[in-house]
Interface confidence: medium
């Protein structure tokens, strides 16, 4: 028997520095977690103690904090190289700055293989990107070899900016021939490493013949055997065992997100490459694990540029950006409109001639808007200003919801109207009319939504049984501010870009902004 230790991360999302327990900015260092310096300490400790160790990343290193905004992926390559990752799969967010934003900072600089078997380049890009990412890689580990085959969510064109010269194929269809090829090369231990979410990870384990282990990402799935060490609630045991169609027991793992945990899986193979046993658990990277001093020093050196960036002008406003709670928790506010417009703009993807865009709607809890911006400071808007408006370090995510769920969400928005509560929704691509004279739960009297399958966008009545795409804060997608119906009824949830980054990019693009209050939210006392 031969034993392999798989260490794995996924969805780190630019958390190079340690964070608080909820993965936001570290405030009290004695209670902080994660970060590459602490990760390196634990990885080195395991590498010294165990013979056959692989360190793998399942994608979405890109996007999430000011580190990515400023360094644009160079930080990912630098620190992953320093940690000596063995392989990485491409995630959807690796394409956020286009293909060039992946090639130059990461693909050309990484000293480890970057993988995806279901992304095929065509046209002029094919030769430019050739060899910079691979469908699979055979890695020597001790006296043996292990095949790693990569995959990426086929939804990436809707979630990021991969351009028109990359084709995202069905994961299972693309993986099988690559695994077969590895088998012909006499590689009998094969790990599928990828970024398509837990449901697809399980399908790959079930359907792709020859895959021994699946290491996934994208869905931020936390798996744990026993009593979990922090706030995350396990979606299942670690590893999650799937019985493949050909009768094998295939372990599937994921390690939550944001570098909070290091996935730790021990696999025992027999001489024919069959998995005999698998066990392990994610390791919580809390303050009991010291930060490696050399990596920490490097982080501090790179940090300097971030502090300078925070005070630079991104663009100008020629109007007061009303982000006050007196406005945003009671009525349409122009800060809410600005943020929602930025959220939609960030999700412009012309992937189908029938649609002007794949999503037109945004909702945003008024309580998430924490500060106004005064235009009388020469109109200047800085990252620092935006960090006061959006201080929670969240993301703006893409969900799919039924019309009936949206209706419930808007009822919840005003169910206790007048108490300055945070659930009052700001909107984009939506016209809502409330009648507050009616009982809670029956106050939404009109809800029109901007069409997507149209050449000239116009507002149509919400159809209760239709499925709509909506951009919203991850806080709402997770049921925050009492929006349990969103969490319970969402049909799909894809994690998006850092909130401040979305708004800052929009302001930089527009250069001068002047958002208005324009009748997106109205109040009526209608008779019937």
């Amino acid at each position: 028997a031969w034993e392999l230790t798989i260490l794995h991360t996924n969805d780190v999302h630019s958390r190079l520095e340690q964070t608080s327990e909820d993965s936001s900015k570290c405030v009290n260092a004695s209670r902080c977690m994660g970060g590459v310096a602490r990760l390196f300490t634990k990885v080195q400790q395991i590498r010294r103690a165990e013979p056959n160790v692989l360190l793998l990343d399942a994608g979405d290193q890109y996007q999430g904090t000011i580190w990515f905004t400023v360094y644009k992926g160079a930080e990912v390559a630098h620190f992953m190289n320093a940690l000596r990752y063995d392989a990485m799969a491409l995630g959807n967010h690796e394409f956020d700055n286009g293909v060039e934003g992946l090639i130059e900072p990461l693909l050309k600089e990484a000293k480890f293989p970057i993988l995806s078997a279901n992304i095929k380049a065509k046209g002029p890009l094919a030769s430019q990107i050739s060899g910079l990412y691979l469908p699979y890689k055979v890695l020597p580990v001790g006296d043996e070899v292990v095949g790693i085959v990569g995959y990426t969510s086929k939804e990436t064109p809707f979630l990021s900016n991969p351009g028109t010269n990359l084709v995202f194929e069905d994961e299972i269809t693309a993986l099988q021939p690559e695994v077969d090829k590895l088998k012909t090369l006499n590689v009998n231990k094969i790990i599928a490493l990828g970024h398509s979410g837990f449901e697809m990870d399980k399908l790959i384990a079930q359907k792709v013949r020859g895959v021994d282990v699946v290491v996934g990402g994208h869905s931020n799935t936390f798996l744990y055997t026993g009593n979990p060490p922090s706030k995350e609630v396990p979606a299942g045991k670690y590893p999650f065992i799937v019985t493949s169609d050909d009768g094998r027991k295939v372990p599937v793992v994921q390690a939550y997100a944001f570098g909070k945990y290091l996935g730790y899986l021990k696999i025992e193979f027999d001489e024919r490459g069959n998995v005999i046993s698998s066990h392990g658990n994610p390791i919580l990277l809390n303050s009991s694990i010291p930060e490696d001093p050399s990596i920490k020093a490097d982080i501090n050196k790179w940090r300097i540029k971030l502090d300078n960036y925070s005070t630079q002008e991104l663009g100008k406003t020629i109007v007061y950006l009303d982000g006050s709670s007196q406005s945003c928790r009671f009525r349409e506010c122009n800060m809410g409109n600005l943020i929602c417009d930025a959220m939609i703009n960030n999700n412009l993807r012309h992937t189908d001639e029938m649609f002007w865009n794949h999503v037109s709607m945004c909702i945003l809890n008024g309580g998430g808007i924490r500060s106004p911006i005064d235009e009388r400071n020469n109109g200047t808007i800085t990252w620092e200003n935006l960090a006061a408006v959006l201080p929670f370090g969240g993301t703006f995510d893409l969900v799919q919801l039924k019309g009936s769920t949206l209706k419930k969400a808007f009822e919840h928005s005003v169910h206790r109207y007048g108490q300055s509560t945070g659930e009052f929704l700001q909107v984009g691509g939506i016209h809502v009319v409330y009648d507050l004279s009616r009982k809670p739960g029956d106050r939404v009297v009109k809800l029109d939504v901007l069409c997507t399958k149209c050449r000239v966008p116009s507002y149509d009545p919400l159809k209760m049984d239709e499925v709509y795409k909506v951009i919203l804060p991850n806080f709402l997608a997770n049921g925050g501010d009492g929006f349990q119906m969103i969490k319970d009824e969402l049909l799909r949830h894809d994690s998006g870009d850092q909130d401040i980054n979305v708004v800052s990019t929009y302001i930089s693009k527009m250069k001068v902004i002047y958002p208005a209050v324009e009748g997106r939210i109205k109040f009526s006392t209608g008779s019937h």
Epitope: K407, R438, K446, D460, H528
Partner: antibody, heavy 125, light 110 residues
Framework: EVQLVESGGGLVQPGRSLRLSCAAS????????MHWVRQAPGKGLEWVSG????????GYADPVRGRFTISRDNAKNSLYLQMNSLRAEDTALYYC??????????????????WGQGTTVTVSS | QTVVTQEPSASGTPGQRVTISCSGS????????VNWYQQLPGTAPKLLIY???QRPSGVPDRFSGSKSGISASLAISGLQSEDEADYYC???????????FGGGTKLTVL
Amino acid sequence: EVQLVESGGGLVQPGRSLRLSCAASGLTFDDYAMHWVRQAPGKGLEWVSGISWNSNSIGYADPVRGRFTISRDNAKNSLYLQMNSLRAEDTALYYCAKDMGWELLKTSYYGMDVWGQGTTVTVSS
Amino acid sequence: QTVVTQEPSASGTPGQRVTISCSGSSSNIGGNTVNWYQQLPGTAPKLLIYSNNQRPSGVPDRFSGSKSGISASLAISGLQSEDEADYYCAAWDDSLNGRVFGGGTKLTVL
């Protein structure tokens, strides 16, 4: 496929009562307002009554107000029209129709996007 | 009597463009949105236009609606024989607190 099927029509004497039913399938019934619309032989369409998704808002056309009662049972996916004190001028084909919205308010007026095939009510002595 | 009026009949030849109009008052068409319904012989009505000018999916773009003041109109371009039907406009009426239909227009394709 969304379907509305009316039943309960027939021949009835003036002054008597009749109860029409409409069975809905293929939709989440309690998400929508519902209506009764009638069409006298050789004549145009006439809105009779409407009811909001949760029965909180109900409306009637003047000629039937006080005589007809609209109701719904969301658990049974059914809409009803109780017609009392029937008159000869109530003779018509009665259609059940689904609203595009959930309310009966002017602010949420869109239109009726699914119709049944109708049930005939004849009031005659 | 009908509070929203339509001309009783209209006609056109195949390929032609025909317009059916509907006239009301400030309490209905003037202050509210208009729908149009098509009723083919012996069948139930079908929603053709809502919110003045919006077509439900499946309705050909040959049909278009517009509204100006207290009048609304339905235009049918590239008239086809299968367009022969009764056409009804409808609106909310504030004074009646309910929905009203026009008297209907019978369209004949010559």
